[in-house]
């Protein structure tokens, strides 16, 4: 190899060892009967050398540094050449470095031809191995602007007082052009300006100077985003830290065309703007830091640009001003992550504060819009608390558990609407009366409606789930001893059409001791399946539940249990079941931890089934499933 550098070229070539390889014998640069591991060639020198091995790229790297002095004479502006040409260099990983020194008052602009640049964070690498490392200068201090790959949105970087640009090319890369030019500009009066151009939908992740280390004290950095007018941009902060400020406040400022409040100032912890049409600027302003404990300011953020959806221009009013103790959350439904670009899906408050989830609280009227390609990616979860603190005031009082129409009119699917029903302990109980009788969901007879009610205890220490119930069954009412949550969960978009079938009334009633009482009025010709609460986990210990089963005058009810034994093993106490005729009060008592379960039995009159649990040993729980079937009373079976 021969490398000759012209005089006055201000180029230095350095060949040195790269990352150690443990799989190859040492290799040397051989030059006039000497073997060396570092070779420096300066302007005006011509050196002939060889390598002592076949694959020097496994051992050595080459750095070509050109110093460009804009202090003492005119600056060589325009397209930057790769000198010496890559064809004249040994095939090693190469780094071309341009070090431009300029006066503080002179702005320097790096312009990147297509493909533009994409900033990468610490620990990331570029797929093709080509990286651009750009740094600036504040007095004598070097400031890292960032490391960039190809195929991005960054088209220009403006700095002042000097710039250092390092282009790293892997040994096998055929690139023979720098891909950028330098132009002079007037002073930019800040650390740097990064221009990011979007041609269409896409995203860009950008970072403050020196990231992940601290942004220079009291500095200003600006990003200019060029976005086609028909697209919308949203900003989200992925990661940030604040330093300890002595004077001034760290902030971001947006210049948004058309805004009457430019610049719009935000704290870093604020929700950042979304749904912005066209170009905008974002600036990061540091502060004077506390000398003793400065901390660090750093910011990593993402700009997402996408088509406005039809929904993004529609404003929905959610009037919760007459509601109390209610919160509505719109959030992404869980999905498997895909590797391809997925446009953002945001919900916006007052059209500007957009985020992937939003919680609205009662007592106000809210205006929301959506910036989302597919609203099925979002769902709604609502929580409302109905509580009674004074039992004298609440007794016999009723509340309708219905989804407000404002919520049903939103273009987002309702997932859960939960009512937390709270009563004073040992003073009142609750009764749920559905508009349409309910069916309990079982494996034998699953619910196939578009929604169900999930009923569970709302006492933190109590793990008690009464079950899932849907319209179209035989359960006329459910009485519960104490606090519960009732969740209307939807399973299909057709809920909107079936919404009229929802309707549940809760009333506060005098306190009773049983955990739950189900009133069942079976219809003829249909088998009613019923099961104990907490199916699969077992009825909680020492818990008692009852079923009040009505039998019409002209019918007979067949009560059938679906296993021979209950399977419960008691640690303390006894588990038992009482079947009691309501008219005669005649009752049969079964020891569930000892006896076999009764064979199918026939009942001519309404009857009770009461199941009370012991304290079972773990793994031997009490789970019972039974059915009730009505048949016409044609023969006197007695």
């Amino acid at each position: 190899f021969e490398i000759a550098l012209p005089r006055e070229s201000n180029i230095t070539v350095l060949i040195k060892l790269g990352t150690p390889t443990l799989l190859a014998k040492p290799c040397y640069i051989v030059i006039s009967k000497r073997h060396i591991t570092m070779l420096s060639i300066k302007s005006g020198e011509r050196i002939v050398f060889t390598f002592s091995c076949q694959s020097p790229e496994n051992h050595f790297v080459i750095e070509i540094q050109k110093n460009i002095d804009c202090m003492s004479g005119p600056c060589p502006f325009g397209e930057v050449q790769l000198q010496p040409s890559t064809s004249l260099l040994p095939t090693l990983n190469r780094t071309f470095i341009w070090d431009v020194k300029a006066h503080k008052s002179i702005g320097l602009e790096l312009q990147f031809s297509i493909p533009r640049l994409r900033q990468i964070g610490p620990g990331e690498s570029c797929p093709d191995g080509v990286t651009h490392s750009i740094s600036g200068r504040i007095d004598a201090t070097v400031v890292r602007i960032g490391t960039f790959c190809s195929n991005g949105t960054v088209s220009r970087i403006k700095m002042q007082e000097g710039v250092k640009m390092a282009l790293h090319l892997p040994w096998f890369h055929p690139r023979n052009v720098s891909g950028f030019s330098i132009a002079n500009r007037s002073s930019i009066k800040r650390l740097c300006i990064i221009e990011s151009v979007f041609e269409g939908e896409g995203s860009a992740t950008l970072m403050s100077a020196n990231y992940p280390e601290g942004f220079p004290e009291d500095e200003l950095m600006t990003w200019q985003f060029v976005v086609p007018a028909h697209l919308r941009a949203s900003v989200s902060f992925l990661n940030f830290n604040l330093s300890n400020c002595e004077r001034k406040e760290e902030r971001v400022e947006y210049y948004i065309p058309g805004s009457t409040t430019n610049p719009e100032v935000f704290k870093l912890e604020d929700k950042q703007p979304g749904n912005m049409a066209g170009n905008f600027n974002l600036s990061l302003q540091g502060c004077d830091q506390d000398a003793q404990s400065p901390g660090i300011l750093r910011l990593q953020f993402q700009v997402l640009v996408q088509h406005p959806q039809n929904e993004s221009n529609k404003i929905y009013v959610v009037d919760l001003s007459n509601e109390r103790a209610m919160s509505l959350t719109i959030e992404p439904r869980p999905v498997k992550q895909s590797r391809k670009f997925v446009p953002g899906c945001f919900v916006c408050l007052e059209s500007r504060t957009c985020s992937s989830n939003l919680t609205l609280t009662s007592g106000s009227k809210h205006k929301i819009s959506f910036l989302c390609d597919d609203l099925t990616r979002l769902w709604m979860n609502v929580e409302k608390t109905i509580s009674c603190t004074d039992h004298r005031y609440c007794q016999r009082k009723s509340y309708s558990l219905q989804v407000p129409s404002d919520i049903l009119h939103l273009p987002v699917e309702l997932h859960d609407f939960s009512w937390k029903l709270l009563v004073p302990k040992d003073r009142l109980s609750l009764v749920l009366v559905p508009a349409q009788k309910l069916q309990q969901h079982t494996h034998e007879k699953p619910c196939n409606t578009s929604f169900s009610y999930l009923v569970a205890s709302a006492i933190p220490s109590q793990d008690l789930y009464f079950g899932s119930f849907c319209p179209g069954g035989s359960i006329k009412q459910i009485q519960v001893k104490q606090n519960i949550s009732v969740t209307l969960r939807t399973f299909a978009p057709s809920f909107q059409q079936e919404a009229s079938r929802q309707g549940l009334t809760v009333s506060f009633i005098p306190y009773f001791k049983e955990e739950g009482v189900f009133t069942v009025t079976p219809d003829t010709k249909s088998k009613v399946y019923l099961r104990t609460p907490n199916w699969d986990r077992g009825l909680p210990s020492l818990t008692s539940v009852s079923w009040n089963i009505s039998v019409p005058r002209d019918q007979v009810a067949c009560l059938t249990f679906f296993k021979e034994r209950s399977g419960v093993v008691c640690q303390t106490g006894r588990a038992f079941m009482i079947i009691q005729e309501q008219r005669t009060r005649a009752e049969e008592i079964f020891s569930l931890d000892e006896d076999v379960l009764p064979k199918p039995s026939f009942h001519h009159h309404s009857f009770w089934v009461n199941i009370s649990n012991c304290s079972p040993t773990s793994g031997k729980q009490l789970d019972l499933l039974f059915s009730v079937t009505l048949t016409p009373r044609t023969v006197d079976l007695t």
Partner: antibody, heavy 118, light 106 residues
Framework: EVQLQQFGAELVKPGASVKISCKAS????????IEWLKQSHGKSLEWIGD????????NYNQKFKGRATLTVDKSSSTAYMEVRSLTSEDTAVYYC???????????WGQGTSVTVSS | IVMTQSPQSMSMSVGERVTLSCKAS??????VSWFQQKPDQSPKLLIL???NRYTGVPARFIGSGSATDFTLTISSVQAEDLADYHC?????????FGGGTKLEIK
């Protein structure tokens, strides 16, 4: 098995010369440099120089340049170091080592003790 | 390139964690080796390329660092680890070594 064999001890008079040998075995002698190092009593290691048997090329520490000469005999896979104009300051143990993978001195001779005394 | 080792000597009990430091006056990449030299023996290679354990070296010897700051850690020192420890750079000529650290066992 890679081995570097050095002979035990040399007693020489001030002003004289000494030639120390280092016989390599168990690998291809031409593929790796031989490094020479000095260790005075109770002191750390000091690099004298190295030789590339393939190119017969040498590098020296400036401190020893002109007084130390490194050579090799490829036929016997032996490296030599000659030090001239010895003084009491040259009393030390001299090691040869192979510069192996990762540019690390992976195999060492047992050292030759040189005592310069009248 | 000047290599500076610290401390010059240290006395540790069996089972303790030992950290030896080696600083280079200039960037030497990862071309630093660590050697163990027991009394009246030649040095033995422990760590090559800053962090790679040499064949047969016990796992308690751990090398780390790059550029100018390097560390040899012995996670749980044993009686047989009594020795001098040297670091050296082979990034550029002339190759240089630190002054060594003498490890004594209490």
């Amino acid at each position: 098995e890679v081995q570097l064999q050095q002979f035990g001890a040399e007693l020489v008079k001030p002003g004289a010369s000494v030639k120390i040998s280092c016989k390599a075995s168990g690998y291809s002698f031409s593929d790796f440099n031989i490094e020479w190092l000095k260790q005075s009593h109770g002191k750390s290691l000091e690099w004298i120089g190295d030789i590339n048997p393939n190119y017969d090329s040498t590098n020296y520490n400036q401190k020893f340049k002109g007084r130390a000469t490194l050579t090799v005999d490829k036929s016997s896979s032996t490296a030599y170091m000659e030090v001239r104009s010895l003084t009491s300051e040259d009393t030390a143990v001299y090691y040869c080592a192979r510069l192996g993978y990762g540019y690390a001195m992976d195999y060492w001779g047992q050292g030759t003790s040189v005592t310069v005394s009248s | 390139i000047v290599m500076t080792q610290s401390p010059q000597s240290m006395s540790m009990s069996v089972g303790e964690r030992v950290t030896l430091s080696c600083k280079a006056s200039e960037n030497v990449g990862a071309y630093v080796s660590w050697f163990q030299q027991k009394p009246d023996q030649s040095p033995k290679l422990l760590i090559l390329a800053a962090s790679n354990r040499y064949t047969g070296v016990p796992a308690r010897f751990i090398g780390s660092g790059s550029a100018t700051d390097f560390t040899l850690t012995i996670s749980s020192v044993q009686a047989e680890d009594l020795a001098d420890y040297h670091c050296g750079q082979s990034y550029t000529y002339p190759y240089t070594f630190g002054g060594g650290t003498k490890l004594e066992i209490k």
